[in-house]
């Protein structure tokens, strides 16, 4: 570690050519965790380039990544989940650039799924529900969800609602009648763990009724 330049400008210059970013997913496959890294410049020639993680591991000093096209990937149970790991880009055993990263700060949850919308005629509202695999997990259990919805004709006019539960009520009076809506949801860690938004769930499409309409699940 001590061989690094102390000057801030030099330090950043060292990273420029091989700048990369990573995200972790905990208990992504049973009790296995994953770590995915990729170069920020898609034009980097990745031939002969390897990734390695050292430190904050159980029973081993270092682990090498598998290369899958342009991404680098590890699936393992051996993350200690406390302390910083050193992730390095290497060529021929020589480190080109390294980053110290705490894997609990780069967590990307799995995307929510089973998003649906049910219209309640008596209540004049829409009940939005979805599911997340994180309800069954032991580490990243607490998430903040971002539900985004828009009238299909309004290309970029998304409305957002943040919530910690997997159920949301939208009042009919806040939506246009007889309109097609698109809705989707994503998640981010919210207790102790930090990181990134998940991918969006698949979108669900629903039509708002005229002022009087029958109850039941909205037709997709």
């Amino acid at each position: 570690e001590s061989g690094y330049a102390q000057n801030g400008d030099l330090e950043d210059a060292e990273l420029d050519d091989y700048s990369f970013s990573c995200y972790s997913q905990l208990e992504v496959n049973g009790s296995q965790h994953s770590l995915t890294c990729a170069f920020e410049d898609p034009d980097v020639n990745t031939t002969n380039l390897e990734f390695e993680i050292c430190g904050a591991l159980v029973e081993v000093k270092c682990l090498s990544f598998r290369k899958l096209q342009e991404i680098y990937f590890i699936e393992t149970k051996k993350f200690l989940l406390i302390g910083k790991s050193n992730i390095c880009v290497k060529v021929g055993g020589k480190s080109l650039t390294c980053k110290k990263i705490d894997l609990t700060t780069i967590v990307k949850p799995e995307a929510p799924f089973d998003l649906s919308v049910i219209y309640r005629e008596g209540a004049n509202d829409f009940v939005v529900t979805f599911n997340t695999s994180h309800l069954q997990k032991k580490y990243v259990k607490v998430l903040m969800h971002d539900v985004a919805y828009r009238q299909e004709k309004d290309e970029n006019k998304w409305m957002h609602v943040n919530l910690s539960s997997t159920k949301l009520t939208l009042l009919q009076r806040n939506l246009q009648p007889e309109a097609m809506y698109e809705i989707k949801v994503r998640s981010i860690p919210d207790h102790y763990f930090k990181g990134f938004w998940s991918e969006w769930s698949p979108s669900y499409y629903f039509r708002t009724p005229e002022i009087n309409n029958s109850p039941g699940e909205m037709d997709p």
Epitope: E1, Q6, L81, I82, G83, D102, K138, Y139, Y192
Partner: antibody
């Protein structure tokens, strides 16, 4: 070797401010957050807050919010802790400490004694 | 804030004997197998020194007579065979929730 070297002892009057420095060496400065922990005479340890030298982002103990400011200077690998509106209860040894992980402290400075007295 | 209660306040142990220090927290500091509890040793006139992180992980360079255990709200630091140089005050610390709080300390002396 990894070292944190702090500025010297200070004597201040009530109501004044004090600024303590902590110079890091032996590792890449932006790789680790640096925190401040204080210890009043004969007392235990109290976390004040921390700073990420890479981003300048800070986290402060609510108890000190509005009175404490932490800054960093990447060009000199130094962090600073300024405490304002000093009172006699702020008399303590102030330590800077490197966070080896979230949030435990694996390297400590030698401490800076701040005495607040009229 | 999470309150950390250390016991005993002080402990006198014969050289070569076992010393056990307990730390209880007002709420859980564990997330499954991730235990956000750490132990420090402080000798007079010196800064604290990290001994154990994550409840049971020995910091590099720390003698293996020191060990840590526990989960949830109850944690223990054990010195398996007390040496003269272990005379110090020992502190526990939690890092699950800001503000990160320390126990009041346990003074270990030679009997």
């Amino acid at each position: 070797q990894v070292q944190l070297v702090q500025s010297g002892a200070e004597v201040k009057k009530p109501g004044a401010s004090v600024k303590v420095s902590c110079k890091a060496s032996g590792y890449r400065f932006t790789d680790y957050e640096l925190h401040w922990v204080r210890q009043a005479p004969g007392q235990g340890l109290e976390w004040m807050g921390g700073i990420d030298p890479k981003t300048g982002g800070t986290a402060y103990n609510q108890k000190f919010k509005g009175r404490v400011t932490m800054t960093s200077d990447r060009s000199t690998s130094t962090v600073y802790m300024e405490l304002s509106s000093l009172r006699s209860e702020d008399t303590a040894v102030y330590y800077c400490a490197r966070s080896g992980g979230r949030w435990y402290f694996d390297v400590w400075g030698q401490g800076t004694t701040v005495t607040v007295s009229s | 804030d999470i309150v950390m209660t250390q016991s005993p306040d002080s402990l006198a142990v014969s050289l070569g004997e076992r010393a056990t220090i307990n730390c209880r927290t007002s709420e859980s500091v564990s997330i499954h197998l991730l235990h956000l509890m750490h132990w420090y040793q402080q000798k007079p006139g010196q800064p604290p020194k990290l001994l154990i992180y994550g409840a049971s992980n020995l910091e590099s360079g720390v003698p293996d007579r020191f060990s840590g255990s526990g989960s949830g709200t109850d944690f223990t630091l054990t010195i398996s065979s007390l040496q003269a140089e272990d005379v110090a005050v020992y502190y526990c610390q939690q890092s699950i929730k800001d503000p990160y709080t320390f126990g009041g300390g346990t003074k270990v002396e030679i009997k």
